[in-house]
């Protein structure tokens, strides 16, 4: 069977009782629909002895198999089998296309990999596979960060990928650290970028029939050095019931990598600050920014001792940034709360 | 169907060397990168090693960056991890897995295969 | 390289139970996320790649969002073969840092 703008085995009509296996070669990114039993009473489609579900880019429906945009790993054994029972309806194999030999004797050699020749492929420029993955076409990251420009395509005879930056031949030779050519996943990778990667960077993507290119654009935000940024309202003033569970949120953005402590103000001798100035606290948790859930503080089954002032304390390289809130302890039936007004529960 | 079976586990003592290999079955082999995992007891996932499909492109953990080293036979439908200079803290299941096409999602792994290090 | 950062790394839930695990990276990864689960003595197991991609064969219940910097797992009925640990995994650099996962206990 040569592939065709839409492989398809139509109309859906009951099968012929005499059936035999088939081999479908099918292009990368093509639609398929495949028809089994007559629609109202479809067989059911199952891809290496897995029923296929009614929705999804792969989907069993209605006695169809329908494929949205034919990916390599579609590639393998379907079988369609009649509902109610175990008979085979439709046993068929879905062949890749660029992995077969094509008739064509100026293909591009990597299209020649298969000697069985069973089937010839038409000849395809290069489309895009996943223009998703390229809706973002200006990249501003900071200094130091990694970049990754993609351009997924297909075509036959498969194209190649090149890169060119501001319109020149790019193979990273005079770059820092160099590049990382991903072919198969039609990526350049840059890693700890600087200011001197800003630019244009261009995929073109190419074979014997036609070429098609994208540009992308690199802006690199050179860092300021800065002590922690601490997200305004964080930690939030607290109101709690006794026996209950509290969280306090800290969010910290920093460079440099950071270092975060929850303190909580405690009081010694009936003073809150000793001779230096400084207040009196108590460490609860200590970590750095990478380690889980450092940036909450969890109270479990809260007291009346729990209450009392909370520090959020960030530090870097750089220097300190801190934030405080106050957690407020009632009693579990405690009239004044329920008469008290909403305003009064709260205070900032 | 898919199939990747790993093999060449076993105890080594430190600064030995060990060459794992993984066969695959079921799929075009040279038309997907394949991967290295290890999880060393009792821990997390790590990620140790990638090829190309055609072995055009490999790159490395940096924690085993200059001792390991990633090849593959298309004929042969295989890939290896051969690693040398071993330590301690390379003591680990090892797994060989598949990367999906046009992602680095891995959509099929091995079983694994124990690595220890030990005098 | 970019560190991948899980929260929390251990929940109790219950069948039927809503779960929501997040991962976190140190930079902006795009969409470059999977998310996989690993039981007791096996290979892991991909639910979801490229962030918000059901794996072929992976029940329904299994979802995936986020972009950038900041990416959630969500099951929304927690069945008893759910159990297990759940790690994400980033493929924006080179080296694919996984996250250092999460346990889903029964309460």
């Known amino acids: 069977l040569e592939a065709s703008e839409e492989v398809e085995l139509e109309p859906c009509l009951a099968p012929s009782l005499e059936q035999q296996e088939q081999e479908l070669t099918v292009a990368l990114g093509q639609p398929v629909r495949l028809c089994c039993g007559r629609a109202e009473r479809g067989g059911h489609w199952y891809k290496e002895g897995s029923r296929l579900a009614p929705a999804g880019r792969v989907r069993g429906w209605r006695g169809r198999l329908e494929i949205a945009s034919f990916l390599p790993e579609d590639a393998g054994r379907y079988l369609c089998l009649a509902r109610g029972s175990m008979i085979v309806l439709q046993n068929l194999t879905l062949i890749t296309g660029d992995s077969l030999t094509s008739s064509n004797d100026d293909e591009d050699p990597k299209s020649h990999r298969d000697p069985s020749n069973r089937h010839s492929y038409p000849q395809q420029a290069p489309y895009w596979t996943h223009p998703q993955r390229m809706e973002k076409k200006l990249h501003a990251v900071p200094a130091g960060n990694t970049v990754k420009f993609r351009c997924p395509a297909a075509g036959n005879p498969t194209p190649t990928i090149r890169w060119l930056k501001d319109g020149q031949a790019f193979h990273g030779e005079n770059r820092i650290g160099g590049i990382r050519l991903r072919h198969q996943h039609w990526s350049l990778v840059m890693e700890s970028v600087v200011p001197s990667d800003r630019g244009t960077y261009t995929c073109l993507v190419e074979n014997a029939v036609g070429s098609i290119r994208y540009n992308y654009l690199l802006d690199v935000l050179e860092r300021s050095p800065h002590r922690p940024i601490l997200q305004a309202g964080l930690p939030a003033n607290t109101t709690a019931v006794v026996g209950s569970d509290v969280e306090l949120l800290c969010k910290v953005y920093s460079d440099a990598q950071p270092h975060i402590q929850w303190l909580k103000h405690i009081v010694i001798n009936g003073s809150s600050f000793g001779a230096d100035g400084f207040p009196y606290v108590q460490v609860l948790k200590t970590a750095d920014i990478n380690s889980s859930e450092v940036e909450v503080l969890y109270l479990r089954n809260v007291s009346a001792e729990d209450a009392g002032e909370y520090t959020c304390l960030a530090g870097n390289s750089i220097g300190l940034s801190y934030q405080s809130a106050w957690l407020t302890v009632l009693p579990e039936e405690d009239p004044t709360w329920t008469a008290a007004a909403p305003e009064a529960r709260y205070t900032d | 169907q898919v199939q990747l079976l790993e093999s060449g586990g076993g105890l080594v003592q430190p600064g030995g060397s060990l060459r794992l290999s993984c066969a695959a079955s079921g799929f075009t082999f040279s038309d997907y990168a394949m991967s290295w995992v290890r999880q060393a007891p009792g821990k997390g996932l790590e990620w140790v090693s990638v090829i190309e499909g055609d072995g055009s492109y490999t790159h490395y953990a940096d924690s085993v960056k200059g001792r390991f080293t990633i090849s593959r036979d298309n004929s042969k439908n295989t890939l290896y991890l051969q690693m040398n200079s071993l330590r301690a803290e390379d003591t680990a299941v090892y797994y060989c897995?598949?990367?999906?096409?046009?992602?680095?999602?891995?959509?099929?792994w091995g079983q694994g295969t124990l690595v220890t290090v030990s005098s | 390289d970019i560190q991948m950062t899980q929260s929390p790394s251990s929940l109790s839930a219950s069948v039927g139970d809503r779960v929501t695990i997040t991962c976190r990276a140190s930079q902006d990864i795009s969409s470059d996320l999977n998310w996989y689960q690993q039981k007791p003595g096996k290979a892991p197991k991909l639910l979801i790649y490229?962030?918000?991609n059901l794996q072929s064969g992976v029940p329904s219940r299994f979802s995936g969002s986020g972009s950038g910097t900041d990416f959630t797992l969500t099951i929304s009925s927690l069945q008893p073969e759910d159990f297990a640990v759940y790690y994400c995994q980033q493929h924006y650099s080179p080296s694919h840092t996984f996250g250092q996962g999460t346990k889903v206990e029964i309460k």
């Open positions: 490229d962030a918000s």
């Open positions: 897995a598949r990367e999906k096409t046009y992602s680095s999602a891995f959509d099929y």
